[in-house]
């Protein structure tokens, strides 16, 4: 290389990361094997769980505003879960990104897209729940499935928009030990006249903006909506059912516990540009908290099912139907099996355009999902405890 050839400019923290070398010590190898196993299992669980949630909520339940939120949340989690196998592969080949720069950008973008989408959707659900209580008449007239889908599309668009910088500034960087990193390189595009200033300002801007937009603001919206609902129901002399408290605690706690540490380390990493002493802490902690954030997508479907007996019931029924249709013998085609099928498909057409994944069910409404964010679990939106409370107090 000639003396004048300018090397690929890297921020100090990134260049120092590229200098870190791998050790083949036994205890580290065991940790790596355990990590691969854990992430592999999480990948499988996440894909299956979120796939099942999408199937059950999208095809086995009457479509409501609530099921719309859940569908989009599950879709976001499914996307994240779909990217986990590639992260598992990265771990399996010794923490080296062997899948190229384009896929590095795409893979990382999915992580951030899920981060923003989850935060935005949780905010929307809590605001929706708040509107139902605070503005019941308006909600009655304007809360439609179509409107919810439109809101979700807007939120997805916003999430994509917020993900663009992470796509642009993601890069593959060769480490001195031969491994390849898939990481931020904020000097990748238009580094400006001063690299130090650019590194500092861009790293801080990315860390602070994602902390605010994907974490702090959604949590503030959830908290203030929860407070507004509590105040309104207390004012009406209605004590909110205990399960709402339990459910909101579960979902919001999962979001906060999974994403909180990631944002803390992300902010520490931005601070580490000016304070190199923080770098070792960041290098050690960031992989763990990133995995924890990924696992939120695996945890969510479990929360949906655990907090919703109706969901569990529909899930069991759906799985039984799927197994019956798969395990049915060819000789049974003229018998009971086919009549059961015929009956299902004929009625499904009237119930849903998705005849293949629909089944005639009494209109029970969505799962009691995401705690206080939703009005009811087993009953339809019109007859849920919240709606009953509203009708009795507003009439």
């Amino acid at each position: 290389m000639s003396a004048n050839a300018t090397l690929k400019p890297l921020c100090p923290i990134l260049e120092q990361m590229s200098r870190l070398q791998s050790h083949s010590n036994t205890s580290i190898r065991y940790i790596d094997h355990a990590a691969v196993l854990l992430h592999g299992l999480a990948s499988l669980l996440g894909l299956v769980e979120n796939g099942v949630i999408l199937f059950v909520v999208g095809c086995r339940m009457r479509q409501t505003v609530v099921t719309t939120w859940v569908l989009h949340l599950a879709l976001s989690d499914l996307l994240a879960s779909a990217s986990l196998p590639f992260f598992t592969y990265f771990l399996a080949v010794g923490h080296s990104w062997e899948l190229g720069t384009t896929f590095c950008k795409l893979h990382s973008s999915i992580f951030f897209l899920n981060m923003f989408a989850s935060g935005f959707l949780l905010s929307a659900i809590s605001l929706d729940r708040c509107l139902q209580v605070v503005r019941p008449v308006w909600a009655q007239n304007h809360r439609t499935v179509a409107a919810a889908h439109k809101v979700c599309l807007v939120l997805w668009a916003l999430a994509v928009l917020n993900t663009v910088p992470y796509f642009v500034f993601r890069d593959t960087i060769s480490r001195l030990d031969g491994r390849i990193m898939c990481y931020y390189n904020v000097l990748l595009l238009n580094p400006g006249p001063d690299r130090d200033a650019t590194c500092n300002s861009r790293q801080v801007a990315l860390a602070v903006s994602k902390f605010l937009l994907a974490f702090l603001v959604p949590l503030a919206i959830i908290a203030s909506s929860h407070a507004a609902v509590s105040l309104r129901l207390q004012h009406r002399g209605r004590r909110r059912p205990g399960r709402f408290v339990r459910l909101v605690a579960a979902v919001v706690a999962a979001f906060a516990l999974c994403w909180g540490p990631y944002h803390v380390f992300s902010l520490l990493e931005a601070r580490a540009h000016a304070n190199p002493g923080l770098r070792p802490l960041v290098w050690r902690g960031l992989p763990f908290v990133t995995s924890l954030a990924f696992f939120n997508s695996v945890a969510n479907p479990v929360l949906y099912v655990l907090t919703c007996p109706d969901m569990l019931r529909k899930l069991r029924r759906s799985l039984r139907t799927v197994l019956e249709s798969v395990l049915v013998d060819d000789s049974e085609l003229g018998g009971a099996g086919s009549s059961r099928r015929r009956r299902t498909s004929s009625t499904a057409r009237s119930a849903s355009p998705l005849a293949l994944c629909s089944r005639p069910e009494e209109p029970r409404g969505p799962a009691r999902l995401l705690g206080w964010l939703l009005g009811s679990c087993a009953a339809s939106p019109q007859t849920g405890p919240l709606n009953r409370a509203l009708s009795s107090t507003s009439s």
């Epitope: 300018t6 921020c11 870190l20």
Partner: antibody, heavy 118, light 107 residues
Framework: EVQLVESGGGLVQPGGSLRLSCAAS????????MSWVRQAPGKGLEWVAR????????DYPGTVEGRFTISRDNSKNTLYLQMNSLRAEDTAVYYC???????????WGQGTLVTVSS | DIQMTQSPSSLSASVGDRVTITCRAS??????LAWYQQKPGKAPKLLIY???QLADGVPSRFSGSGSGTDYTLTISSLQPEDFATYYC?????????FGQGTKVEIK
Amino acid sequence: EVQLVESGGGLVQPGGSLRLSCAASGFTFSSYLMSWVRQAPGKGLEWVARISNGGSTTDYPGTVEGRFTISRDNSKNTLYLQMNSLRAEDTAVYYCARHRTNWDFDYWGQGTLVTVSS
Amino acid sequence: DIQMTQSPSSLSASVGDRVTITCRASENIYYNLAWYQQKPGKAPKLLIYAATQLADGVPSRFSGSGSGTDYTLTISSLQPEDFATYYCQHFWITPWTFGQGTKVEIK
């Protein structure tokens, strides 16, 4: 060919001031971080100051902080070291050095001698 | 400040000898170490960066190793032009300090 040529050294009294210059050629000066390193006669090397490629960030060791100021003029491809309140222990050969990336001095000038004596 | 301790401070060796110089940091410097060679009346010359990486134009008989706080410069077969003073320098946290130097002399 990369070249770094220091100038401005000489004899100065304690408490006096001096400004060193380093003329750079053979590379895109504005793309590189630069430093000053000194070496007292018969002694080891000591890093004195560092400046980012655009000049917005500077760093100094405690021994010179507040007395020395590093600056650069990218339009003139020149690095400077303004030395104030000079002491006898500042007597040394002062080298300007180019950073390979963020660190590691890959090219050095031939040095300029600064003598602080009454 | 991080202290860099070089050993030995001087050594005598013959052409063809294998020479090892060590540098110990007072705390972990995470591979952020460079080795320089300086001949009398000349400016230092970069030999090794990032603890193990050979700088451009440096003969392959020079090599660097180590991690954490302990680093080594090895000259596999000493040549006449290698008689000089060698310095290590860390680039972890400012101030970036140098070792006191190791003078390699002809036996």
